[in-house]
Interface confidence: medium
Amino acid sequence: DTHKSEVAHRFKDLGEEHFKGLVLVAFSQYLQQCPFEEHVKLVNEVTEFAKTCVADESAENCDKSLHTLFGDKLCTVATLRETYGEMADCCAKQEPERNECFLQHKDDNPNLPPLVRPEVDVMCTAFHDNEATFLKKYLYEVARRHPYFYAPELLFFAARYKAAFAECCQAADKAACLLPKLDELRDEGKASSAKQRLKCASLQKFGDRAFKAWAVARLSQKFPKAEFAEVSKLVTDLTKVHTECCHGDLLECADDRADLAKYMCENQDSISSKLKECCDKPLLEKSHCLAEVENDEMPADLPSLAADYVESKDVCKNYAEAKDVFLGMFLYEYARRHPDYSVMLLLRLAKAYEATLEKCCAAADPHECYAKVFDEFQPLVEEPQNLVKQNCELFEQLGEYKFQNALLVRYTKKVPQVSTPTLVEVSRNLGKVGAKCCKLPEAKRMPCAEDYLSVVLNRLCVLHEKTPVSEKVTKCCTESLVNRRPCFSALELDEAYVPKAFNAETFTFHADMCTLSEKEKQVKKQTALVELVKHKPKATKEQLKGVMDNFAAFVEKCCKADDKEACFAEEGPKFVAASQAALA
C-alpha cells in the first residue's frame, strides 16, 4: 500500500492535531536538550510542509521518506554540535544510517532538572492563557525525559492532562481537584514509560522473536477464547506497531495502532468478550483500554496439553516442520491455561520445552526422552512462587519503606559497583512491588510481581549499559531476557568488591533536610544506607538497623531544634563517629 507522499498520507490519516503532537514527541525524544521554542518552530515548519503535500502530492520533496524529512529538519538545528557533541556526526550520514545514529544517541538518563510543579493558580492561568502551548509543553517535557515513551499513549496522557485542567480550574477548590489527578498521571506515566522501555529493549537487544514470544504469552492469557490463528495475527500487528515506535517511526506507529484497535473492535467475537466497553470509546481512550483490558474467562473444556505436546507421536514431526510455529502453539496453549503465571515464567517453560525437543528429537527414542518434560517444569514454577510468597511476607511485616531498605541492602551487596542514585531508584521501585501486588489474590500475585520486576530490572540494565561498572550486571542483563530476574535473585554478596573508603562528606547533613517532603527525606536516608553498605558490605542487618534508627533520631531531633543548622553541625559529627564505631 504505497503512497506518492508518505507525509501527506500520515497527515490525512492522523489529522493535524495528532500529526503535530507526534512530530513534537519525535523531535523531543531525539533532541532532548533543545529548548521548547526551537522544537515548536521545527514542528510548525514540518506541518506547513505536510499541508503543501496534502494539496499536491507531486510537489517538491513530498516523495521523500519521513526519516529523510525529519532527519533533514533536525540537522538544521544550529547548536547541534555544541549541545550534543558527537550526535552532530549523525548528520553526515545517509538514511537509514542517520536515523539509526540518532536512535543510538537517545539518552535514558538525560541531565535535565526535575520537573517542578508550580502553584495551582499559576498553572490554571497558563492553561487558560494558551491551552495549546500549555499542552505542547507537557508533551515536550515528558518526551525529552522519556525518549522511549509510547507516543500514541503519550497523546492519551496529554488528553487526560487537558481534561484535568479543564475540570479543576473551574472547581471551588482547584488544588484538591487537580493535585490528585496530576499525581495519578505522573505515577501512571512513569509506569507506562518503564513498561514501554522493556518492550523496546526486548526488540532492540533480543530481536522480534523475543518480543513476539512475549506477546503470544500475554495475549493468550488475555484472550484465552481466541484461536491461535487470531492471537498470531494480533501478535504480528502488535510487533509492527512497537517496532515502529521503538524505531522512532511515530506517525506510522500511531496509524498502525489505530488500525489494530479498529480490527480488534470489528472482530470482538473471535477475540474476547471483554472488548465491548473499550470499543465504544474515542480512539486514544479505546487503544489504551484495549491494551489494559482484563483477561477473558478461560474456556471451560480445555483438554490436557499432554496429548498434543508429550503423548502424540507427531511431536517431533510437527516441531521439525516449523519450529517457531509449533513452539508458538505450545506457548499459546500453556498461557491461555495459566493466567496465574507470569509471562516471564511462561517463556521460561517454552524455552525448557524447546531445549528438551532439540535434545530428544535427535535421540534414538524421542518419545521416551521427552516423556517426562512436564515434570522438569515444576522447579521453574516453584521458584517464582516461593519468591513472591517470601517477599510478600517480608513486605507485610516491614511496610513499604523498610521493605525498600531491605532491598537496598540486598542489591547493594549483590552489585556494589553500581552508582548510588541508580541503586536507590531501582531498589525503591523494586520495593513498590509489595503495595502493587501483595494485596492481590493468590492467582494474580505472580504475574503482577514478576512481570513488574522485569520492568524495573530493565531500568537497571538500561542505566548500566550507559555506564557499565559491573560484570555481574552486564551478564544478567545480556545473557537472557527471560532469566534476568532469576539471575539477579541468584546473585550473592560480591566477595571481590573492595569496600568504599569512608567519606564523612557523604554523611554530612544540613537544615535543608527539614524542609524536604517525606519522599525526599526517605531518598536522603536511603542514599546514606547504600553508602553505608558500600563502606561495610558485610555489616549485619542489626548493625545497619541500629545506624539507620540513630540517623532518624538525629534528623528528628535537629529538625525540632530552634537553631537547626547549629544542631546539624554539632550532632552530625557525633552521629558519624557513633556509626563508624557501630560498624567497626
Epitope: 490463528a229 498470531s232 510437527n318 516449523a322
Partner: nanobody
Framework: EVQLLESGGGLVQPGGSLRLSCAAS????????VAWFRQAPGKGREFVAG????????YYADSVKGRFTISRDNSKNTLYLQMNSLRPEDTAVYYC???????????????????WGQGTLVTVSS
C-alpha cells in the same frame, strides 16, 4: 478463483476405513491453510482436521485424534483424510475448505474459510 472437489465418501461398517480426497485447482494447496470439516444432519459445520500452509503442522479435533490422519500431496495438489476405526457418530457430509490469507495456521471456525468444495457423504452403519 479456487475450486475444491471432494471424493471418496460412501457407506462403511463401524470399525472400517475410508480415504477422502480433495482436489484443488486455481491455487497451490501447499500455500494455503486447509481443513476438513463435517456436517451431520441438523447440525453446524464441525472442524475435523487441519494442516498449515507451507508446513505440514497438523491439527485434529479431540473426537478424531488417533483415528484420522490429514495429509496432502503437493505434486497432485490434493488434500487427503485417512479415516480409520470409524464410528456411527462419524456419519456426516465431509467438506474441505481452504484459507489462503494466513499460511501456517488453520482455524477451527468454518466462517474463516472462504473456499469450499461441494462435500462428500460418509455413512457409518452396520
Amino acid at each position: 478463483e479456487v475450486q475444491l472437489l471432494e471424493s471418496g465418501g460412501g457407506l462403511v461398517q463401524p470399525g472400517g476405513s475410508l480415504r477422502l480426497s480433495c482436489a484443488a485447482s486455481g491455487r497451490y494447496i501447499d500455500e494455503t491453510a486447509v481443513a476438513w470439516f463435517r456436517q451431520a444432519p441438523g447440525k453446524g459445520r464441525e472442524f475435523v482436521a487441519g494442516i498449515g500452509g507451507g508446513v505440514d503442522i497438523t491439527y485434529y479435533a479431540d473426537s478424531v485424534k488417533g483415528r484420522f490422519t490429514i495429509s496432502r500431496d503437493n505434486s497432485k495438489n490434493t488434500l487427503y483424510l485417512q479415516m480409520n476405526s470409524l464410528r456411527p457418530e462419524d456419519t456426516a457430509v465431509y467438506y474441505c475448505g481452504t484459507r489462503p490469507g494466513r499460511p501456517l495456521i488453520t482455524s477451527k471456525v468454518a466462517d474463516l474459510y472462504p473456499y469450499w468444495g461441494q462435500g462428500t457423504l460418509v455413512t457409518v452403519s452396520s
